[in-house]
């Protein structure tokens, strides 16, 4: 699992493996902060609950994040 508790960022390495959105259990978005200067995207896969750190700049992830922003705007008053 490419996660670390010893460094400030959660992700040590970014997976370049393509992610089939249908195989995603969930997506967690950790915004940039004083502890980690970059946005981190952590995918939990349905199969075995494997966690992967994904590249926020990839086209696939940008499309998934587009759907997230739509969901956020639906919930905002």
């Amino acid at each position: 699992v490419p996660l670390s508790r010893t460094v400030r960022c959660t992700c040590i390495s970014i997976s370049n493996q393509p992610v089939n959105p249908r195989s995603l259990e969930k997506l967690e978005i950790i915004p940039a902060s004083q502890f980690c200067p970059r946005v981190e995207i952590i995918a939990t896969m349905k199969k075995k609950g494997e966690k992967r750190c994904l590249n926020p700049e990839s086209k696939a992830i940008k499309n998934l994040l587009k759907a997230v922003s739509k969901e956020r705007s639906k919930r905002s008053p």
Epitope: P21, R22, L24, E25, K26, A60, N63, A67
Partner: antibody
Framework: QLVESGGGLIQPGGSLRLSCAAS????????MNWVRQAPGKGLEWVSS???????YYADSVKGRFTISRDNSKNTLFLQINSLRAEDTAVYYC??????????????????????WGQGTLVTVSS | QSVLTQPPSASGTPGQRVSISCSGS????????VNWYQHLPGTAPKLLIY???QRPSGVPDRFSGSKSGTSASLAISGLQSEDEADYYC???????????FGGGTKVTVL
């Protein structure tokens, strides 16, 4: 709305390109699928193309079928090569609807085919 | 042989309740939501239930869906003659990396 075309009678080993013209939404922004139904059989998923251009195929068609799209024409395609008798079916294109729910900081994605075409018949026979 | 198992047929008289089962495994129904489609021969399949139990607008509330573990079911209460059709369950299979359908259930209104 989705309208398929390109079906017909073709000999075993032949090739065919099916088209699916979309209106009312953009094929580039959505996930698109091909699903088929052989005579007297049930629905069978064939292939999907996602908005990042990644493609997926059923094992039965892998290496023979190619899904693609032309964003300028707002059209989905299925190139079918090395046709076999068992490929005889009505071929439907269908749009995947994506929706997202959230709990805490986690986002969950769900998909379902909400728009279907009327289908185009491909008959493989000598 | 379909990955998801449905009974080939179901029937009832008008007004009756009919239930259709859909049995799968941990790699499909167990880890994904189930969608149900209604199909009349010669027409486009129609989405009936999504996300296990949600009805799209325009689908009568006579149709309901549920899921438990690796099985799902579709219920039609107050059966009507226009409900005569084939019904398919579907889910993503993470082992096959593809969408899988049940074999379909033909509903007949007696």
């Amino acid at each position: 709305q989705l309208v398929e075309s390109g079906g017909g009678l073709i000999q075993p080993g032949g090739s065919l390109r099916l088209s699916c013209a979309a209106s009312g939404f953009s094929v580039s922004d959505t996930y698109m699928n091909w699903v088929r139904q052989a005579p007297g059989k049930g629905l069978e998923w064939v292939s999907s193309i996602y908005s990042d251009d990644s493609t997926y195929y059923a094992d039965s068609v892998k290496g023979r079928f190619t899904i693609s799209r032309d964003n300028s024409k707002n059209t989905l395609f299925l190139q079918i090569n090395s046709l076999r008798a068992e490929d005889t079916a009505v071929y439907y294109c269908a749009r995947d609807k994506e929706y997202v729910t959230s709990t805490g900081g986690a986002y969950y994605y769900f998909y379902y085919m909400d728009v279907w075409g009327q289908g185009t018949l491909v008959t493989v026979s000598s | 042989q379909s990955v998801l198992t449905q009974p080939p047929s179901a029937s009832g008289t008008p007004g009756q309740r009919v239930s259709i089962s859909c049995s799968g495994s941990s790699s499909n129904i167990g880890s994904d939501t189930v969608n149900w489609y209604q199909h009349l021969p010669g027409t486009a399949p129609k989405l009936l239930i999504y996300n296990n139990n949600q009805r799209p607008s325009g689908v009568p509330d006579r149709f309901s869906g549920s899921k438990s573990g690796t099985s799902a079911s579709l219920a039609i209460s107050g059966l009507q003659s226009e409900d005569e059709a084939d019904y398919y369950c579907a889910a993503w299979d993470d082992s096959l990396n593809g969408l899988v359908f049940g074999g379909g259930t033909k509903v007949t209104v007696l």
